[in-house]
Interface confidence: medium
């Protein structure tokens, strides 16, 4: 069968028809519709939005649209006992209290059910003690404190600024340092770009604005009570003491007005260097405790949030494939938001909605994709990627046999400067070819391709004339598909200029000020960047679902494997004597990479030449491409992280958002000179090299001629 059997127009025209159907005005309208009230996971409002999306996707023409529900652990503030932090004097009197809520933005004063700022899954507690300022609370910040400055965080409340790494890693680091509470705050150095006004007059964070967010360390487990299995009606749930990834100490976020009041009194050690200073008019002393006259004052946290098993709802839409209905290309993004979700997630959900509408329009004209396309509106992403993970756990056997690709669709924008793509190397060529066909929305690049503006503004650090494409980390719904199941994945959005804007994420991230107006007034008034992101995400899905031969190039994997092997080898070579003493060799890894390169090259040659009219051979070659990503999965997972099973990529152990290459070897080598037992530590390095070399070799062999 040809891929056009279900239609009377050529594939090229199909793609053009699909892209031409995408309209900026529709995305704008959908964004407005999705952002008028909060859609917090587990609430009635979010359930109603799920039903609305289900109904509209059906109208758009999908074959079926179902709700998939799960009962998962969520976390909410106590409505009658608000969370706050106070400074108390020696008599225990509260002489300063942090604010209980963010001042609502203009036009939203009467909106109900705005959840106050809180750290989701914080345990309850009222610890009091001296404060220690720990910078970003990264691994290296605690090394500086404990090893260099000899400051002991045990029994202290630590205050850390948001940014650089996932907040859950900050909390984990604080726990390991012995802290009894964590205060997270947004420093203007990270969340207030110079020369821009604060909301509502600009896109900067006002002093009363606060970033919400979960503080779990799930490592890919999904629902903390049902790791590995779906949280369905007959689920066996762990007790809360055995739940995965919950923090053990109270945590609470504040804005920079409140942070100023805590930090201005800090005494003790001066900051070790300028990288520990933010932009507040405070000394950024590390502590412990307050200075001089204030030394008898303490900080007290009052945290009363509760963890509750709550029902969540995914929306799953299906557009059946005409030729290979048992091959799935998935486009998914979340629907739940902390408050209005102006950017996160609804700028992404609006794009997905328009992509569904465009595909539905083509379907109504008699067209079908070659492969099945699944569309997903995930719930409870903000609470730990729960909706996507539970659905993938429930459908893991189908997905591992049938999953071709997963394209993520959270926030479409985090800036309006250039494109940002993170994906498997298998998709590099797809992304390059697609962006060469799309028009750039950027000023000064009229009539030029998206590829050209992207390459100019975000050049690859390795290859001239090519754009930067980053490794997949985590912190979003692709995690279970890529890191656990080994399904080729990618994500794309418009981003800021990282050279000139050093702040973390976008300033209003997870605050009440993330509104429709923020996007419409300041980020993308014409919705041209949203449209471009829709074209990239939609175009990738279209090609993955419709091209006769899957648009994966295994040679690009060979290139990065060599780069990653070189990188990890150079890290290890910082310890030449130990490598000699313990007979540590990377020969097996480099040999496997060489074999992979040669086999991938031969496979690519065969891919050019084979008879595409023979459906059996076509399916065989496509299966080799589809299963290549799967071949990098180790069923045993990474040490202490059983749900991170990809041997080439995993979220960094020090920052969930970042991707790490050869993570097993990297973690074994990390800070190895501090390991008490060097023989054991270097033994683990050798074991991880063995696992990596075996996996690369095994993956290479899946590309060999089958007989």
């Amino acid at each position: 069968k040809s891929s056009n059997e279900a239609t009377n127009i050529t594939p090229k025209h199909n793609m053009k028809a699909f892209l031409d159907e995408l309209k900026a005005e529709n995305i704008k309208k959908f964004l407005y519709n999705f952002t008028q009230i909060p859609h917090l996971a587990g609430t009635e409002q979010n359930f109603q939005l799920a039903k609305q999306i289900q109904s509209q996707w059906k109208e758009f023409g999908l074959d079926s649209v179902e709700l998939a529900h799960y009962d998962v652990l969520l976390s909410y503030p106590n409505k009658t006992h608000p969370n706050y932090i106070s400074i108390i004097n020696e008599d225990g009197n509260e002489i300063f209290n942090t604010s209980l809520f963010e001042p609502p933005p203009p036009g939203y004063e009467n909106v109900s059910d705005i959840v106050p700022p809180f750290s989701a899954f914080s345990p309850q507690g009222m610890p009091e003690g001296d404060l220690v300022y720990v910078n970003y609370a990264r691994t290296e910040d605690f090394f500086k404190l404990e090893r260099d400055m000899k400051i002991n965080c045990s029994g202290k409340i630590v205050i850390a600024r948001y940014g650089k790494v996932f907040r859950g890693n900050k909390v984990k680091n604080a726990q390991l340092a012995g802290a009894k509470g964590v205060i997270l705050y947004s420093d203007p150095a990270d969340y207030f770009a110079p020369g821009v006004k604060s909301y509502p007059d600009g896109w900067n964070l006002p002093g009363g604005g606060v970033q919400r967010g979960n503080i779990l360390n799930l490592n890919g487990a999904g629902d903390p009570l049902t790791p590995g299995y779906p949280a369905n009606e007959y689920a066996y749930r762990r007790g809360i003491a055995e739940a995965v990834g919950l923090p053990s100490i109270p945590v609470h976020p504040i804005g920079y007005y409140d942070a100023q009041k805590l930090l201005e009194k800090m005494g003790g050690s001066a900051p070790p260097d300028s990288s520990w200073r933010g932009s507040l008019k405070v000394p950024y002393n590390v502590g412990p405790g307050f200075t001089g006259n204030f030394s008898t004052q303490k900080v007290k946290m009052h945290i009363h949030s509760t963890n509750e098993v709550t029902r969540i709802y995914n929306v799953i839409g299906t557009l059946r494939g005409a030729v290979e209905p048992d091959r799935y290309v998935i486009l998914g993004g979340h629907r739940d938001s902390w408050v209005f979700g102006g950017i996160d997630p609804q700028s992404g959900a609006a794009v997905v909605h328009e992509i569904v509408r465009s595909f539905g329009t083509l379907k109504k004209e008699g067209w079908r994709p070659r492969r099945t396309i699944l569309f997903a509106s995930w719930d409870a992403e903000e609470f730990g990627l729960l909706g996507s993970t539970e659905w993938a756990e429930e459908n893991s056997r189908l997905l591992q046999e049938r999953g071709v690709a997963y394209i993520n669709a959270d926030s479409s924008i985090e800036g309006n400067y250039t494109l940002r793509v993170d994906c498997t190397p298998l998709m590099y060529s797809l992304v390059h070819n697609l962006t060469k066909e799309l028009k750039s929305p950027d000023e000064g690049f009229e009539g030029k391709s998206l590829y050209e503006s992207w390459t100019k503004k975000s050049p690859s650090p390795e290859f001239s004339g090519m754009p930067r494409i980053s490794k997949l980390g985590s912190g979003n719904d692709f995690e279970v598909f890529f890191q656990r199941l080994g399904i080729a994945s990618g994500r794309a959005r418009y981003t800021k200029n990282w050279e000139t804007n050093k702040f973390s994420g976008y300033p209003l991230y997870h605050s009440v000020y993330e509104t429709y107006e923020l996007v419409e007034k300041f980020y993308d008034p014409m919705f041209k960047y949203h449209l471009t992101v829709a074209q990239v995400r939609g175009g990738m899905v279209f090609e993955l679902a419709n091209s006769i031969v899957l648009p994966f190039d295994c040679r690009d994997y060979a290139v990065v494997l060599r780069k990653y092997a070189d990188k990890i080898y150079s890290i290890s070579m910082k310890h030449p004597q130990e490598m000699k003493t313990y007979s540590v060799s990377f020969d097996s890894l480099f040999s496997a990479v060489k074999n992979f390169t040669e086999i991938a090259s031969k496979f690519s040659e065969r891919l050019q030449d084979f008879d595409k009219s023979n459906p059996i051979v076509l399916r065989m070659m496509n299966d080799q491409l589809m299963f290549l990503e799967r071949a990098f999965i180790d069923p045993l997972g990474l040490p202490d992280r059983p749900f991170y099973r990809h041997v080439i990529y995993a979220p960094s152990s020090h920052n969930k958002y970042a991707g790490e290459s050869f993570p097993g070897i990297y973690d074994a080598l990390f800070d190895i000179e501090s390991k008490v037992d060097p023989s054991k530590a270097w033994g683990e390095v050798k074991r991880q090299i063995y696992v990596a070399a075996f996996t690369v070799q095994a993956a290479a062999e899946t590309l060999s001629e089958v007989a």
Epitope: N152, E578, E673, V676, P678
Partner: antibody
Framework: EVKLEESGGGLVQPGGSMKISCVAS????????MNWVRQSPEKGLEWVAE??????????HYAESVKGRVIISRDDSKSSVYLQMNSLRAEDTAVYYC???????WGQGTTVTVSS | NIVMTQFPKSMSASAGERMTLTCKAS??????VSWYQQKPTQSPKMLIY???NRFTGVPDRFSGSGSGTDFILTISSVQAEDLVDYYC?????????FGGGTKLEMK
């Protein structure tokens, strides 16, 4: 095999000075923080000083009992760490051990006797 | 300074017996506690690190446990060569400190 070998101990008069040395082998010396720990019948095991690696700016830390009287130093090109001891007192009499970070490997020790 | 207190100062054991040595920290040191064995005329050798991890080459009759302030070294079946001195030490914070030692003697 990790080896630490101290030398330079001996008899010294109160108020005098002495420099003891430790040569390391079997590991990438420049990566590691090094310590001196001493042992006497009166005080038992007592940590004396630590010197960090180049990446930690060769930071040094000392026990209160020796602060201002001893200097720890290192020469990565010779895989050696030193302890310069001044204004020695009778209570500094001990076997001095050179140890690698977290005291997981110890040398055989060198004896310093402060006596008139 | 964190004071590490070991008790008893000495104890008698027979071959094959199970022995428990105790170490108490004056404040919370997490699990940053090591145990050392010292034979006459030799330097101390690490047995246990991180409160419960056996160091390379240490026989599995030695085990450690505890966290916070209370730590235990257990010898499941004492051998004649184990009748020597044992020290605990903390590397949680400066100054690193050691216990006064426990001498294991023949019954």
């Amino acid at each position: 095999e990790v080896k630490l070998e101290e030398s330079g101990g001996g008899l010294v008069q109160p108020g005098g000075s002495m420099k003891i040395s430790c040569v390391a082998s079997g590991f990438t010396f420049s990566n590691y923080w090094m310590n001196w720990v001493r042992q006497s019948p009166e005080k038992g095991l007592e940590w004396v000083a630590e010197i960090r690696s180049q990446s930690n700016n060769f930071a040094t830390h000392y026990a209160e009992s020796v602060k201002g009287r001893v200097i720890i130093s290192r020469d990565d090109s010779k895989s050696s760490v030193y302890l310069q001891m001044n204004s020695l007192r009778a209570e500094d009499t001990a076997v001095y051990y050179c140890t690698r970070r977290w005291n997981n490997f110890w040398g055989q020790g060198t004896t310093v006797t402060v006596s008139s | 300074n964190i004071v590490m207190t070991q008790f008893p100062k000495s104890m008698s054991a027979s071959a094959g017996e199970r022995m428990t040595l105790t170490c108490k920290a004056s404040e919370n040191v997490g699990t940053y506690v090591s145990w050392y064995q010292q034979k006459p005329t030799q330097s101390p050798k690490m047995l246990i690190y991180g409160a419960s991890n056996r160091f390379t080459g240490v026989p599995d009759r030695f085990s450690g446990s505890g966290s916070g302030t209370d730590f235990i070294l257990t010898i499941s079946s004492v051998q004649a060569e184990d009748l020597v001195d044992y020290y605990c030490g903390q590397s949680y914070t400066f100054p690193y400190t050691f216990g006064g030692g426990t001498k294991l003697e023949m019954k």
